[in-house]
């Protein structure tokens, strides 16, 4: 808390500029008008203020906007955003994607902080759903974002947003999350032609039921082992040896290297040895 002192003669700031870096903390408090700061927030980032000085500027904004900052100020916070607490951010009403991008840019290259998580939560709740543009933006900054959401939160993702999802965005998703995303992906891609459809849906197949895998096994898809290893164990277990052979096509030989890992291990144990022997891979049930 900075003590209230009168501004020395001739030091009253008429604009936010580089001369302010030479002000002591108490001088910033006394000589910078909060309303001026709010209207010239975009200049703050161009000035090499110390962290202590930024604390003073934040304090001034807090006094001016006790109920939370307006979006016109939030959009230009820049590095001052790093000074905000989740409690501060919960008071905000962020509706512009440009504002969100500007603040995510400040945190770029770092782990998702509690501040960023709160900001995203406020933004998405304000929009009512995770639309395509938002998802596009969030996964560009945080590829693991989608998989950080609960299945309940994912259920509010509209199928149209699935077009923004890249394979790497799903790398850390667990089966419960893919169970929610797979039907949305099916809906999103349902009008694509065959080979293009399979390329798009492949990343989501960890949520596919047995009947879809059976159907795909009859259509020369040549699923790679990496995709097969991410399938739900309960969806793979009912597949016959012939179906798995057709599903994987030339990649079936890769089963040998994965025979000790799920779901391959559990699937092998469900098959008759005679059927496994038809693969010629030396798999032991």
């Amino acid at each position: 808390e900075v003590e209230k002192t009168a501004c020395p003669s001739g030091k009253k700031a008429r604009e936010i500029d580089e001369s302010l870096i030479f002000y002591k903390k108490w001088e910033l408090e006394a000589c910078v008008d909060a309303a001026l700061l709010a209207t010239q927030m975009d200049r703050v980032n161009a000035i090499p203020f110390t962290y202590e000085q930024l604390d003073v500027l934040k304090h001034k904004l807090d006094e001016l906007y006790p109920q939370g900052y307006p979006e016109s100020v939030i959009q230009h916070l820049g590095y001052l955003f790093l000074k905000m607490s989740p409690e501060d951010i919960r008071k905000w009403n962020v509706t512009s994607l440009e504002t969100l991008k500007a603040l995510l840019e400040v945190n770029k290259g770092h782990e998702m902080s509690p501040q960023v998580a709160t900001l995203i939560d406020r933004f998405v709740k304000g929009r009512g759903q995770l639309d395509k543009d938002t998802l596009d933006t969030l996964t560009a900054f945080y590829p693991g974002y989608l998989c950080s959401l609960s299945p309940e939160e994912l259920s509010s993702v509209p199928p149209s947003s699935i077009w923004a999802v890249r394979p790497q965005d799903l790398d850390t998703c667990d089966p419960r999350q893919l169970d929610v995303l797979y039907p949305k992906a099916r809906l999103a891609f349902q009008n694509m032609n065959g080979s293009e459809y399979f390329v798009k849906i492949q990343s989501f197949l960890g949520g596919a039921p047995t009947e879809d895998l059976k159907a795909l096994s009859q259509q020369n898809v040549s699923m790679d082992l990496a995709t097969f290893m991410k399938l739900r164990t309960d969806a793979v277990l009912p597949l016959t040896v012939a179906e798995v052979q057709k599903l994987l096509g030339p990649h079936v030989e890769g089963l040998k290297a994965e025979e000790r890992h799920r779901p391959v291990r559990d699937w092998i144990l469900r098959q008759r040895q005679d059927d496994l022997d038809t693969l010629g891979l030396g798999l032991q049930g």
Partner: nanobody
Amino acid sequence: QVRLVESGGGSVQAGGSLRLSCAASGNVYNNMCMGWFRQAPGKEREGVASIYVGGGYTNYADSVRGRFTISQDNAKNTLYLQMNSLKPEDTAMYYCAAITVALTRAFCAPIPSRYTNWGQGTQVTVSS
């Protein structure tokens, strides 16, 4: 997952008509196939007609072409089989089935081994 329930079967005189319905519950997508199949006592299950849910493709067995019409109501997730000019040899248990993922329309041909989801069936009896 898709569950299928048939209705509309019954007994009819030769030359008469029946309309079978199949209600699909669960997720129905455009890139799915739905079809009608039948099995007479002591015979193998055979394809009657099929349709690509996304539209633009129907397929009929030679024995029913021109007499039977397959159609769908996407809003109600319901498949229909309008059967006209029925013959005694049409007597069978009629099944509705689905292929949950079809990468091409052509894959929707009414070949029983391709279909992964089946209803319980509805009996059609045609007397001469």
